[in-house]
Amino acid sequence: IWELKKDVYVVELDWYPDAPGEMVVLTCDTPEEDGITWTLDQSSEVLGSGKTLTIQVKEFGDAGQYTCHKGGEVLSHSLLLLHKKEDGIWSTDILKDQKEPKNKTFLRCEAKNYSGRFTCWWLTTISTDLTFSVKSSRGSSDPQGVTCGAATLSAERVRGDNKEYEYSVECQEDSACPAAEESLPIEVMVDAVHKLKYENYTSSFFIRDIIKPDPPKNLQLKPLKNSRQVEVSWEYPDTWSTPHSYFSLTFCVQVQGKSKREKKDRVFTDKTSATVICRKNASISVRAQDRYYSSSWSEWASVPCS
Amino acid sequence: RNLPVATPDPGMFPCLHHSQNLLRAVSNMLQKARQTLEFYPCTSEEIDHEDITKDKTSTVEACLPLELTKNESCLNSRETSFITNGSCLASRKTSFMMALCLSSIYEDLKMYQVEFKTMNAKLLMDPKRQIFLDQNMLAVIDELMQALNFNSETVPQKSSLEEPDFYKTKIKLCILLHAFRIRAVTIDRVMSYLNAS
């Protein structure tokens, strides 16, 4: 058993049918010695008396808010949560496996630049009685500070018969140098509590590996005289790290017809302009990627050919 | 990216082209190592990230873009002095910092070159003959060093008398390639920045 926060405790259980569970001793936080009784949750049934209560925690029915009273007055509370270990593996019931970029990916994180700011998100089908708490650091043995905000519900989607809820959090490394070469990964730890179930999820990454630039901005077309060709031009996104000559991007320019089946013409360039043939009803799209370290491409910025 | 690429003119700065070749070569070598050594811990998540140049050179700090020198987090650097002549600086007004930066890059390359050559000698003794260093990568390191043209004492190649542990050598190769790729990215950024200055 360990303390998650004041008066909230996590009991770790080897989870299998007929498991013996864990013996837990609760102590009433009071100078009083006599006439103390214990109850669980809203029940008025007295579970025991005395300053300490010994319980065998086996199932969720044994978890909950234990309260010690004296003469009708509440003295203190202890909330017991359960953390299930199933055949050596901690349970992952609360969050959905996003399966990207690999199986057992529960937390996904992205950064728009090298400033040390990043966003992580996760999915669940649970709508109520759900709380999250996020901590982060650079490295784990001698951790350096990363500050995270509160996790918030950022999107709701309908997936088949189920509703899916996306939560996200923003974090910022306390002292980040955009040019630094990372040798210690960022660690992100999410504590999830659903009713009386506790779970924790972790992700470990280098900022360089989660970079996904914003799409190029100010995408414009300039027709060339007496030609079907157009000059496409764009700019670096505002959120990208500066100076741009140091943090350079490379770009992919795509000409896509109305039908998804039509052949796509693609050109790669390090410049912020390109000359392409504009077909009728086609659209021109441009996306960006770090020129030197191949992390994710940005989303496409698009303009119609007409 | 096996598609048409509009390559920029390397311009006046002779080292930019070499640094781009270096990054391409080390990235290819790392990819090859990951594939060949699939049953070894060779991915970024699995290896320990070690920097053999730590406390010996200060490339990131010495080559910091002017715009980032205002960032306190970028300035916890160690003072290191280097030889200050080099042909990449030809026909340019060069500051002491720029010379320091390029000589730091030269020292990095020299250290990695020695490590890679020592490692290759060991890998050539492996009866499995599973993986060797790409000669192209070693050649590209050499070309960039020549372009930088700094005079510096030659570091003798490390020789080991004991029987090499090939498993450890291959893991060390992965560690070295990951670190060198990261340094090659920094070198490419620096050359691009200097080329634009």
């Epitope: 080897d14 989870w15 299998y16 049918p17 007929d18 498991a19 199932e59 969720f60 270990k85 199933e86 055949d87 050596g88 593996i89 992952t92 019931d93 496996d97 690999k102 199986n103 057992k104 089908t125 | 049953f39 811990p41």
Partner: antibody, heavy 115, light 112 residues
């Protein structure tokens, strides 16, 4: 005590279907994940499928994917394995087992696929 | 579909120590715990070892398990006639949730 009683095995022709059942007692069935494991005559153990405690996720061995469906009815404390498009190589003793460090196994039920 | 490799058979005389190896990879034994089962002819497998080296109550202490890197082993110190059976190791595949992977199985024969 924890008990798993299996039923539904038998002889079936190739291409036909069969449904195996596994009735659980002596524990809170709805709190635990369950597996199906099989053993072909004279061969080793092969994992077939897994279902989480609430039925929200199901996982299958490649050899049965698309043909077998694992399901559960927590109100009836019963685990099922629906087997379709059966092949000769599906001939085996099928076991249901609880998920956890100390697993309990059913007695096994024989499925023979033969023409 | 067997991912874990065991020797097909091992034998020993009563009182001898016999060991069974189980070789896997980084995604199974390398990153998950190992179990061992004993299966007598015509019966369901019986759990002998869980969590690499833990014995459930009721399992004689002559059975012990260990794990190192991507391999595991089961030792029977002072093998007895009633230990003649098939033995299977089992782990999980890290990349796929809930995927149990079994060993090829080892037939233990007690001689004499």
């Amino acid at each position: 005590q924890v008990q798993l009683v299996q039923s539904g095995g038998g002889v079936v022709q190739p291409g036909r279907s069969l449904r195996l059942s596994c009735a659980a007692s002596g524990f809170t069935f709805s709190s635990y994940g369950m597996h199906w494991v099989r053993q072909a005559p004279g061969k080793g153990l092969e994992w077939v499928a897994f279902i989480r405690y609430d039925g929200s996720n199901k996982y299958y061995a490649d050899s049965v994917k698309g043909r077998f469906t694992i399901s559960r009815d927590n109100s009836k404390n019963t685990l099922y394995l629906q087997m379709k498009s059966l092949r000769a190589e599906d001939t085996a003793v099928y076991y249901c087992t609880t998920h956890g460090s100390h697993d309990t196994w059913g007695q096994g039920t024989m499925v023979t696929v033969s023409s | 579909s067997y991912v874990l490799t065991q020797p097909p058979s091992v034998s020993g005389t009563p009182g001898q120590r016999v060991t069974i190896s189980c070789s896997g990879g980084r995604s199974n034994i390398g990153s998950n715990t190992v179990k061992w089962y004993q299966q007598l002819p015509g019966t369901a497998p019986k759990l002998l070892i869980y969590g690499n080296d833990q014995r459930p109550s009721g399992v004689p202490d002559r059975f012990s398990g260990s794990k190192s890197g991507t391999s595991a082993s089961l030792a029977i110190t002072g093998v007895q006639a009633e230990d003649e059976a098939d033995y299977y190791c089992q782990s999980y595949d890290s990349s796929l949730w809930g995927t149990r992977v079994f060993g090829t199985g080892t037939k233990v024969t007690v001689l004499g």
